[in-house]
């Protein structure tokens, strides 16, 4: 099956202090390689979450990524701050035998728009 990374929401709005879910699903787990979430693109992009076991404060996976055939790589960001605003990308990599992993597909991106906390 052809690999497609889908981020169904173009944008989400969230009040500062609240949490938000960023959805991402894959049509295939092949080729073998990790899935990572970034904010921004190019040289300035920031790694937000990696489904490879590291700990990321305030960011958690929504479903159990270790489950066999799990295609859901959505994440939850808690206690959102204005600094979290930006466009988030779910990116699939192909594992390299010795060289670094190769980025092969990305979702279309989901903008996180942070609203002022209601007073």
């Amino acid at each position: 099956k052809e690999l497609k990374v889908t981020q169904p929401e173009k944008s989400v709005s969230v009040a500062a202090g609240d949490s938000t879910v960023l959805n991402c699903t894959l049509t295939s787990l092949l080729p073998v390689g990790p899935i990572k979430w970034y904010r921004g693109v190019g040289q300035s992009r920031l790694l937000i979450y990696s489904f490879t076991g590291e700990h990321f404060p305030r960011v958690t996976n929504v479903s159990d990524a270790t489950k066999r055939n799990n295609m859901d790589f959505s994440i939850r960001i808690s206690n959102v701050t204005p600094e979290d605003a930006g466009t988030y990308y779910c990116v699939k990599f192909q594992k390299g035998p010795s060289e670094p992993d190769t980025e092969i597909q990305s979702g279309g991106g989901t903008e996180v728009y942070v609203l002022a906390k209601p007073s």
Epitope: K10, S11, S13, V41, G42, T87, E103, Q105, S106, G108, G109, E111, Y113, L115
Partner: antibody
Framework: DVQLVESGGGVVRPGESLRLSCAAS????????MNWVRQAPGEGLEWVSL????????YYADSVKGRFTISRDNSKNTLYLQMNSLRAEDTAVYYC????????????WGLGTLVTVSS | KTVLTQSPGTLSLSPGERATLTCRAD??????LAWYQERPGQAPRLLIY???SRATGIPDRFSGSGSGTEFTLTISSLQSEDFAVYYC??????????FGGGTKVEIK
């Protein structure tokens, strides 16, 4: 049939204001994000601003930030662009554009309205 | 922001000929790219989205290809109504949404 009809263009002096309108029909207006795109004489297309269907999410190009305000009235199926502190470089045809529901490209455009800023 | 560069700036061809327009991005936009046609006095029209999908009602002489940083719009056999200006637009890196500078297809 989708129709977008812009109005409100005209000739103004630098520093003055103008409000553009875009009357939409043929689709469920409140369900779609809407944009303003402009084209200066002899130049290419430049994205100006976008507003989400609910009006909650708004973005501007750096060139107009702090001077232009996008808004919408879903009960009237109308998109607006309030343009303050106009400059000569704002002279352009302003197009209203309906976004696709999946991604941020434009599946329908209006004919545009010409704004001329001249002393 | 992602910069799109279109080439050539002007393409002079005769009706019936094949037109090949190029759009290059300064960083990968995967296949998140659209093409538009703009004729004088008319609203811009969406031709291609997702780099290669034809929009509703667009004749099959228009086709798009490419991914990453290099994209092509091909018009297989130019008709009189195809002489116009063509723009590419990326919707991956946003905001802002960015357009290429345009390619004018004119009658030779």
């Amino acid at each position: 049939d989708v129709q977008l009809v812009e109005s409100g263009g005209g000739v103004v002096r630098p520093g003055e204001s103008l409000r553009l309108s875009c009357a939409a029909s043929g689709f469920t207006f409140s369900s779609y994000d809407m944009n303003w795109v402009r084209q200066a004489p002899g130049e290419g297309l430049e994205w100006v601003s976008l507003i989400s269907g609910s009006g909650e999410i708004i973005y501007y190009a750096d060139s107009v930030k702090g001077r232009f305000t996008i808004s919408r009235d879903n009960s009237k199926n109308t998109l607006y662009l309030q343009m303050n502190s106009l400059r000569a470089e704002d002279t352009a045809v302003y197009y209203c554009a309906k976004e696709n529901n999946r991604y941020r490209f434009f599946d329908y455009w209006g004919l545009g309205t010409l704004v001329t800023v001249s002393s | 922001k992602t910069v799109l560069t279109q080439s050539p700036g002007t393409l002079s061809l005769s009706p019936g000929e094949r037109a090949t327009l190029t759009c290059r991005a300064d960083q990968s936009v995967y296949t998140y790219l659209a093409w538009y046609q703009e004729r004088p006095g008319q609203a811009p029209r969406l031709l291609i989205y997702d780099a290669s999908s034809r929009a509703t009602g667009i004749p099959d002489r228009f086709s798009g290809s490419g991914s990453g940083t290099e994209f092509t719009l091909t018009i297989s056999s130019l008709q009189s109504e195809d002489f116009a200006v063509y723009y590419c637009q990326q919707y991956y890196d946003r905001p802002p949404l960015t357009f290429g500078g345009g390619t004018k297809v004119e009658i030779k």
